[in-house]
Interface confidence: low
């Protein structure tokens, strides 16, 4: 449906404090650099503009696209060429290549300081004094860090934060009500945010059919009483959803998901029994809910797949008549069946469902050729499972620390030329996954533990991408979406690789190591370990455990001495030493 | 994009027929079981009839069976629902829907019996 004014048609559906929100969000992900006060000025501007549009839809330039608008008012930025450099140019182009520009110049990791959390007294001040202006401080840190974060979903986020704030700074104890709302907030966001990285890159750089493929296996799951017609008409709407807000069609993405969510809350009885309880919700808190809700249970009489997929005289037929509905129709049916599966592993078996068709529907007897077709799928079920139990096998004997440190070890020794903070982040991110997922029952693991593994290792392949340094890395994240993981696992040792040049400075540590909070010193040690495994690629696990060990033990003793410093200093000249002596540098 | 669109509703007196009809496109209808379903006002949906892929198999729920009567023709790629004999309890909106399942993924055609 055409309106008049597309700026005054979402102004008019998504009110004006969300408006702004998304606004601001959408200009703090495509200017990473520029400042609070420039961003909040050009938001200012679009919202007085929106609004005279909602006046008279025929005002001047009211007709002009959110683009067209949007990418003016970010081009009036006077620093642009010195802060952004080549980004400058986009600004020569006109729609759509401008926002495609813009979009490319998105930054995964940019160079911006580590949010450091104030007191709780002068956070709770703030907030009192201009509780406005404090939100929007929020949304802007958290979309210039995270430039693909699901805009809607941050402002649910930022919702929290204000409640957060609003309850605990009138509690007697404010420091012990806020910090556990925060910490929960900040790691719930990171997830949400790689979450979504993974689904933008998804539709970027795999395409479209990709992205409702791995959605049909996802929603299949998570409602198998629901028609297939009810499903692909699902799909549909999630993917235009997600390609709006990948594309940076913040405003276009927040209305979509708002009415998703209506349609799917009025047609309940056809989705889902589940959805009751998130249906009673407001609007932002309905929308989370539905994206996170608890798979339906599965219908108790479906019948066996063979006899549509494989006993069929006419799957040939059939296939060739249609083949991405029969395909859909497969994993549709594949994936309600199989809530113990993860997503990837149900579309690696639509994919060898595919490529048998291929074959054989070509073939002289096509159903001779195509009749053991599932036996080809034990093998790819059995794989991730061999490897979840081994692995949370490793995690319960090690614990997450060490269960971390063992990845990092078999990360770098896979592609050592990846830089140390992206191999610590990474290796740490995927140790996580023994927490997150081997307390489950066997049939919650899979589904948990390489779905998460796919979100992180997007996290290493979007940042590999930016500065590429290993061909290896490369090769896994772009030949196959839903191979990349088993493709990582198959690695072995780089024999190609030259250990890095002895440095000393790398291992010299100081006091300040002795204030940090444990995470942060478990990061020291981790990127000392890295850097370890860099030198010496060949170091056996008890030679790195020990020299692993003697360092804890240097940190230990010299954050207990009364002469930090010269401990340290001291101390670790022999660390170092001692280091090189059992490693053989 | 799957399609199902049903038709052949209507007002009808207790004791009269409707057949309903509905037009599938947009997947290989000649590969899957198909089902009716209906829904009263202010009640949830209710399995009425299912047909497999080739239509030598039909079933029936306990409340219509020797009054309807379920039939498909693969080639026009529609499925049909003869309904005989009709009483109150039938009006209701009805949906085709894909494999056998009391969820529906299309708009319904509305039939009522009354007098």
């Known amino acids: 449906d055409a309106h008049k004014s597309e700026v005054a048609h979402r102004f008019k559906d998504l009110g004006e404090e969300n408006f702004k929100a998304l606004v601001l969000i959408a200009f703090a992900q495509y200017l990473q650099q520029c400042p609070f006060e420039d961003h909040v000025k050009l938001v200012n501007e679009v919202t007085e503009f929106a609004k005279t549009c909602v006046a008279d839809e025929s005002a001047e330039n009211c007709d002009k696209s959110l683009h067209t608008l949007f990418g003016d008012k970010l081009c009036t930025v006077a620093t642009l060429r010195e802060t952004y450099g080549e980004m400058a140019d986009c600004c020569a182009k006109q729609e759509p290549e401008r926002n495609e520009c813009f979009l490319q110049h998105k930054d995964d990791n940019p160079n911006l300081p580590r949010l450091v959390r104030p007191e709780v007294d002068v956070m709770c001040t703030a907030f009192h004094d201009n509780e406005e202006t404090f939100l929007k401080k929020y949304l802007y840190e958290i979309a210039r860090r995270h430039p693909y974060f699901y805009a809607p979903e941050l402002l649910f986020f930022a919702k929290r934060y204000k409640a957060a704030f609003t309850e605990c700074c009138q509690a007697a104890d404010k420091a012990a009500c806020l910090l556990p709302k925060l910490d929960e907030l900040r790691d719930e966001g990171k997830a949400s945010s790689a979450k979504q990285r993974l689904k933008c890159a998804s539709l970027q750089k795999f395409g479209e059919r990709a992205f409702k493929a791995w959605a049909v296996a996802r929603l299949s799951q998570r409602f198998p009483k629901a028609e297939f017609a009810e499903v692909s008409k699902l799909v549909t709407d999630l993917t235009k959803v997600h390609t709006e807000c990948c594309h940076g069609d913040l405003l276009e993405c927040a209305d979509d998901r708002a009415d998703l969510a209506k349609y799917i809350c009025e047609n309940q009885d056809s989705i889902s029994s589940k959805l009751k309880e998130c249906c009673e919700k407001p609007l932002l808190e309905k929308s989370h809910c539905i994206a996170e809700v608890e798979n339906d249970e599965m219908p108790a009489d479906l019948p066996s797949l063979a006899a549509d997929f494989v006993e069929s005289k006419d799957v040939c037929k059939n296939y060739a008549e249609a083949k991405d509905v029969f395909l859909g129709m497969f994993l549709y049916e594949y994936a309600r069946r199989h809530p113990d599966y993860s997503v990837v592993l149900l579309l690696r078996l639509a994919k060898t469902y595919e490529t048998t068709l291929e074959k054989c529907c070509a073939a002289a007897d096509p159903h001779e050729c195509y009749a053991k077709v599932f036996d080809e799928f034990k093998p790819l079920v059995e794989e991730p499972q061999n490897l979840i139990k081994q692995n949370c096998e490793l995690f319960e004997q090690l614990g997450e620390y060490k269960f971390q440190n063992a990845l990092l070890v078999r990360y770098t020794k896979k592609v050592p030329q990846v830089s140390t903070p992206t191999l610590v982040e990474v290796s740490r991110n995927l140790g996580k996954v023994g927490s997150k997922c081997c307390k489950h029952p066997e049939a919650k693991r899979m589904p948990c533990a390489e779905d998460y593994l796919s979100v992180v290792l997007n996290q290493l392949c979007v940042l590999h991408e930016k500065t590429p340094v290993s061909d290896r890395v490369t090769k896994c994240c772009t030949e196959s979406l839903v191979n990349r993981r088993p493709c990582f696992s198959a690695l072995e040792v780089d024999e190609t690789y030259v250990p890095k040049e002895f440095n000393a400075e790398t291992f010299t540590f100081h006091a300040d190591i002795c204030t940090l909070s444990e995470k942060e010193r478990q990061i020291k040690k981790q990127t000392a370990l890295v850097e370890l495994v860099k030198h010496k690629p060949k170091a056996t696990k008890e030679q790195l455990k020990a020299v692993m060990d003697d360092f804890a033990a240097f940190v230990e003793k010299c954050c207990k001495a009364d002469d930090k410093e010269t401990c340290f200093a001291e101390e670790g000249k022999k660390l170092v030493a001692a280091s090189q002596a059992a490693l053989g540098l | 994009e799957v399609q199902l669109v049903e038709s052949g509703g209507g007002l009808v007196q207790p004791g009269g027929s409707l057949r309903l009809s509905c037009a599938a496109s947009?997947?290989?209808?000649?590969?899957?079981?198909m089902s009716w379903v209906r829904q009263a006002p202010g009640k949830g949906p209710e399995w009425v009839s299912a047909?497999?892929?080739?239509?030598?198999?039909?079933r029936y729920a306990e409340s219509v069976k020797g009054r309807f009567t379920i039939s498909r023709d693969n080639a026009k790629k529609t499925l049909y629902l003869q309904m005989n004999n009709l009483k109150p309890e039938d009006t209701a909106m009805y949906y085709c829907?894909?494999?056998?399942?009391?969820?529906?993924g299309s708009q319904g055609t509305q039939v009522t019996v009354s007098s």
């Open positions: 829907t894909i494999g056998r399942s009391t969820s529906r």
């Open positions: 947009g997947f290989t209808f000649g590969s899957f079981g």
């Open positions: 047909i497999d892929s080739g239509g030598a198999d039909t």
